[in-house]
């Protein structure tokens, strides 16, 4: 079997986790993809979904998560904006292909969000956001439901409140690449 | 064809205000995120300030903050950049660029901003 | 932010010279990386993304290589259009950030 990887990242909260999912363009361009939660013990769950068929570069923001797809290069752009403690957790994009079940992209993302001074750069970080406005709607695309034994994901959420609830412990172990990357504060 | 061009460049003294603008053309201007980057003459490039699709975001490079702002006007396919508080330090052509994701993928032909007495 | 070192910051050869030139990043940056050539008062022109792939309408004589921290820009025999300054560009990490430049000179 694939030893999945992980990459760590590790910010505080109010920052923005920024991260690229890179897929086989000529396969998967116009698909559906997604951004997953995945809790310890529980199939993965979707927060965030692309339209169907995925438009290029066109943002989808569901709360405070952004996707944006850039058909060319093959690239999923996930971002999470004013980050929580509780968003901590284990994260992956996936691709939809009914009705096969959804494809995986490498690799998973491990989040860690600490308290911190959201106004204040970190030691490592770099304070470079100077607005941040949260539009008055957001585009809540419709996401497949799945229910096959391996893999169950839902609908987007509501409320982003219970989108990342963290797990109660989390497990570092098989964390293979850790990269600190500097960040939006 | 992309199109990208920029003016509002010129000569300007320290401490002084300048206004570049960039009209694009040739796709659907409000789908992407856009950018300033500059070069000082003889130098290399630096990025400078990006703003999301919709506006709601800016960014900007620590050594502009405060005195440049970023902006767009979706409608009339137009980014800008409104330098105030101009030093010498700030002379450089900057070029509007397309974000793509992971790259700049389309660029203006620049417009030189020169902040001298 | 990630700091970008190209090397080496100029290269002198010929037409048909085989020429290489590295990127190196501060951290690791996956695969994010991008190469760019600007001639003297033109806009930087994009030849290579994501690493090694090779930007629509870009002569196959150019490729790129690398993952993590190391880069290579490859011209597998030098043209005479092809003098010219090439910049590396990471889009990992925010934010992004520019090597310094290597120029190809005439010999």
């Known amino acids: 079997a694939t030893k999945l990887t992980e990459e760590k990242y590790e910010l505080k909260e109010g920052q923005t986790l920024d991260v690229k999912c890179d897929y086989t363009l000529e396969k998967f361009a116009s698909s559906q993809k997604a951004w997953q939660i995945i809790r310890d013990g529980e199939m993965p769950k979707t927060l965030a979904c692309t339209e169907r068929p995925s438009k290029n570069s066109h943002p989808v923001q569901v709360g405070r998560i952004i996707l944006e797809d850039y058909h060319d290069h093959g690239l999923l752009r996930v971002r999470m904006v004013n980050l929580q403690v509780e968003d901590s957790g284990l994260y992956q994009c996936v691709i939809y292909q009914p009705p096969k079940e959804p494809h995986m992209l490498f690799d998973r993302i491990r989040l860690v969000v600490t308290k911190g001074f959201s106004g204040t750069p970190g030691s490592n970080e770099n304070s470079t956001q100077n607005v941040y406005k949260i539009p008055p709607t957001t585009t809540k695309a419709l996401c497949p439901l799945y229910t096959s034994p391996r893999t169950v994901t839902q609908a987007p959420p509501k409320s982003t409140a219970d989108v990342s609830t963290p797990d109660s412990e989390i497990n570092l172990t098989n964390v293979t690449d850790i990269i600190r990357v500097p960040v939006f504060n | 064809e992309v199109q990208l061009v920029e003016s509002g460049g010129g000569l300007v003294q320290p401490g002084g205000s300048l206004r570049l603008s960039c009209a694009a053309s040739?796709?659907?201007?409000?789908?992407?995120?856009m950018s300033w980057v500059r070069q000082a003459p003889g130098k290399g490039l630096e990025w400078v300030a990006n703003?999301?699709?919709?506006?709601?975001?800016?960014y900007y490079v620590d050594s502009v903050k405060g005195r440049f702002t970023i902006s767009r006007d979706n409608a009339k396919n137009s980014l800008y950049l409104q330098m105030n508080s101009l030093r010498a330090e700030d002379t450089a052509v900057y070029y509007c660029?397309?974000?793509?994701?992971?790259?700049?993928?389309?660029w203006g032909q620049g417009t030189l901003v020169t902040v001298s007495s | 932010d990630i700091q970008m070192t190209q090397s080496p910051s100029s290269v002198s050869a010929s037409v048909g010279d085989r020429v290489t030139i590295t990127c190196r990043a501060s951290?690791?940056?996956?695969?994010?990386l991008a190469w760019y050539q600007q001639k003297p008062g033109r806009a930087p022109k994009l030849l290579i993304y994501a690493a090694s792939r090779l930007q629509s309408g870009v002569p196959s004589r150019f490729s790129g290589s690398g993952s993590g921290t190391d880069f290579t820009l490859t011209i597998s025999s030098l043209r005479p259009e092809d003098f010219a300054t090439y910049y590396c560009l990471q889009a990992h990490g925010f934010p992004w950030t520019f090597g310094q430049g290597t120029k190809v000179e005439i010999k």
């Open positions: 660029a397309r974000d793509y994701g992971d790259v700049f993928d389309y």
């Open positions: 040739g796709f659907t201007f409000s789908s992407y995120w």
């Open positions: 951290q690791g940056i996956r695969k994010w």
């Open positions: 703003i999301k699709q919709d506006g709601s975001e800016e």
